[in-house]
């Protein structure tokens, strides 16, 4: 339904706070290097603007479209040229190629400084000081350094911050209560922005038709007794709803997530029957409850698939009317019957048959030729159950960062070029997949594997494409969405790779390695493994583990000396001397 | 969680005035936008008036505009609806409501009263 001021809209639905958050939200996305305060005074003048729109619907430019409005007010940022360089050419187009060209620029890795977190006591002053502030300060620091994160659901880590602070910043103890509450939003929130991402991904580079499929092989899992009809209608609106977030709509985004809140909890007895908690909660952690809820139990005695997708006379009419419909309706039955599959081995499946049905519907006898499709399902199947069995076994055998190293060697072989900090970060998030996913029973592990890996693997690609250095990922990459982890799998070592020349400097420790955190500690030694195996690709895990246990006794040696940083000079040398012996550099 | 309670409602002549009170427990009151909605036998619940969290923004649905007044005084945990020239047509079950943000969208709050019966004669 048309509304004559698109911003009155959004503001009276959204309301004034939420509209706020969320404009502060997407200009941070898209401005990622502005300072705070400039934001803050944007988002109060776009504020303004809209109630006076609010108020009056025919005044002037109130019925101009958010994005020329949006766009327009980032386009007076005076710094633009200076600080983004070409984004600035952006404001020369004109929309919707300027906004475009905006979301051309969002830059997965900025460079911006870490975040570090103050005293406790500094941070309970500073929330009591001026709250809104300390609140907005958080969605700007999260927006910018997550470009594609989800904006609603930020605002659900935003109520949740703001409750942390509101409860501990009067306990007893304020660090004992705050710090691991405050952990518990960073590891959740980094898990979001990368789930979100893969969204993105496969919206923007996969296009709607990608992003339905896997909503349907999820939402199936997830409503095996919803009809397909009920699933269908869900997805849609999902892919409106995330189609709008992905592409900077942030306002109409969350507007119609709550509009779909809303149709899931009224509609819940046609859904599914685990949704009532989610339902009684308030919006912000009722959307999120349902994106979260647990699959439903499957009907009682669903029938075989084959007689309807293999056995009947009709399939390939049925496919020729209409593919897609016929193709989601087999996604639907085979994903509601598995929920013990990864939604990308549904996803793979789905793909099988549809290749099947488009040659065997052209040939003579296409009964005859289609007959033992679900047979070609069953390599398809056992591939990824194989390969979690294996990796399991080697994570139980293992722990996690010793399994993370072993992911960082067997990924660097693969793929040298890509640069250290990137393959450390993958590779440990790969390596989490272990404490994720192999407690689980045998009928989750797949679905909690493999889905993992997809986003995770994405962050490789999204920072992959940023610079491009490897044909091989770039080729993984965008091939295929759902056959990126078999297709990084079946990597080899990169035979064509250069080792890296040998560097001391790389290899240089100093005492300030004793104050880091564990978790630093073991991002540097992994670093300086990643580094190893790009001079020496053909080492043995047997010669790396016995240089990187050097390493570790030599980095607790010199953390126990007295003269830390003398040790760490002497003995350092003395261990590369060793390592480049060992490795034969 | 918040409570709600409304009060001030009952029986007044056309042209009459009202003003309805609604208190809120819990401490967190101020972080709350406040809105009022109404529902008259056999219709759906309406939106009448929102106010922020600041208490900076207010807005009306156009029916009441110019009659009615929404107000809050976090100090008191209390938002008010002052209620003028009132018509035959205002009768109906007013409810007070609060949520993260002041919209006019009846989904869009968390947390209800049971509601305050205004009847106005003719």
């Known amino acids: 339904d048309a509304h004559k001021s698109e911003v009155a809209h959004r503001f009276k639905d959204l309301g004034e706070e939420n509209f706020k958050a969320l404009v502060l939200i997407a200009f941070a996305q898209y401005l990622q290097q502005c300072p705070f305060e400039d934001h803050v005074k944007l988002v109060n003048e776009v504020t303004e603007f809209a109630k006076t729109c609010v108020a009056d619907e025919s005044a002037e430019n109130c019925d101009k479209s958010l994005h020329t409005l949006f766009g327009d007010k980032l386009c007076t940022v005076a710094t633009l040229r200076e600080t983004y360089g070409e984004m600035a050419d952006c404001c020369a187009k004109q929309e919707p190629e300027r906004n475009e060209c905006f979301l051309q620029h969002k830059d997965d890795n900025p460079n911006l400084p870490r975040l570090v977190r103050p005293e406790v006591d500094v941070m309970c002053t500073a929330f009591h000081d001026n709250e809104e502030t300390f609140l907005k300060k958080y969605l700007y620091e999260i927006a910018r350094r997550h470009p594609y994160f989800y904006a609603p659901e930020l605002l659900f880590f935003a109520k949740r911050y703001k409750a942390a602070f509101t409860e501990c910043c009067q306990a007893a103890d304020k660090a004992a209560c705050l710090l691991p509450k405050l952990d518990e939003l960073r590891d959740e929130g980094k898990a979001s922005s990368a789930k979100q991402r893969l969204k993105c991904a496969s919206l923007q580079k996969f296009g709607e038709r990608a992003f339905k499929a896997w909503a349907v092989a999820r939402l199936s899992q997830r409503f095996p007794k919803a009809e397909f009809a009920e699933v269908s209608k869900l997805v849609t609106d999902l892919t409106k709803v995330h189609t709008e977030c992905c592409h900077g709509d942030l306002l109409e985004c969350a507007d119609d997530r709550a509009d779909l809140a809303k149709y899931i909890c009224e509609n819940q007895d046609s859904i599914s029957s685990k949704l009532k908690e989610c339902c009684e909660k308030p919006l912000l952690e009722k959307s999120h409850c349902i994106a979260e809820v647990e699959n439903d139990e499957m009907p009682a005695d669903l029938p075989s698939l084959a007689a309807d997708f293999v056995e009947s006379k009709d399939v390939c009419k049925n496919y020729a009317e209409a593919k897609d419909v016929f193709l989601g309706m087999f996604l639907y039955e085979y994903a509601r019957r598995h929920p013990d599959y990864s939604v990308v081995l549904l996803l793979r499946l789905a793909k099988t048959y549809e290749t099947t049905l488009e040659k065997c519907c052209a040939a003579a006898d296409p009964h005859e030729c289609y007959a033992k499709v679900f047979d070609e399902f069953k390599p398809l199947v056992e591939e990824p159950q194989n390969l979690i069995k294996q990796n399991c076994e080697l994570f139980e055998q293992l722990g996690e960062y010793k399994f993370q190293n072993a992911l960082l060697v067997r990924y660097t072989k693969k793929v040298p070029q890509v640069s250290t900090p990137t393959l450390v970060e993958v590779s440990r998030n790969l390596g989490k997949v272990g404490s994720k996913c192999c407690k689980h029973p045998e009928a989750k592990r797949m679905p909690c594997a493999e889905d993992y890996l997809s986003v995770v693997l994405n962050q490789l690609c999204v920072l992959h494409e940023k610079t491009p250095v490897s044909d091989r990922v770039t080729k993984c990459c965008t091939e295929s969405l759902v056959n990126r982890r078999p297709c990084f799998s079946a990597l080899e070592v990169d035979e064509t790779y250069v080792p890296k020349e040998f560097n001391a400097e790389t290899f240089t420790f100093h005492a300030d390695i004793c104050t880091l955190s564990e978790k630093e500690r073991q991002i540097k030694k992994q670093t300086a493994l990643v580094e190893l195996v790009k001079h020496k690709p053909k080492a043995t895990k047997e010669q790396l583990k016995a240089v990187m246990d050097d390493f570790a006794a030599f980095v607790e040696k010199c953390c126990k000396a007295d003269d830390k940083e003398t040790c760490f000079a002497e003995e350092g040398k003395k261990l590369v001397a060793a390592s480049q012996a060992a490795l034969g550099l | 969680e918040v409570q709600l309670v409304e009060s001030g409602g009952g029986l007044v002549q056309a042209g009459g005035s009202l003003r309805l009170s609604c208190a809120a427990s819990?401490?967190?009151?101020?972080?709350?936008?406040m809105a009022w909605f109404r529902q008259a036998p056999g219709e759906e619940r309406e939106f009448v008036a929102t106010?922020?969290?600041?208490?900076?923004?207010?807005y009306y649905a156009d029916s009441v505009k110019g009659r009615f007044t929404i107000s809050r005084d976090n100090a008191k945990n209390t938002v008010y609806l002052q209620m003028n020239t009132l018509k035959p047509e205002d009768t109906a079950v007013y409810y007070c409501?609060?949520?993260?943000?002041?919209?006019?969208?009846?989904?869009?709050?968390?947390?209800w009263g049971q509601g305050t019966q205004v009847t106005v004669s003719s």
């Open positions: 409501a609060a949520g993260d943000s002041s919209s006019w969208l009846e989904h869009m709050y968390d947390y």
């Open positions: 819990g401490r967190t009151f101020s972080s709350y936008a």
């Open positions: 106010i922020s969290v600041s208490g900076g923004y207010t």
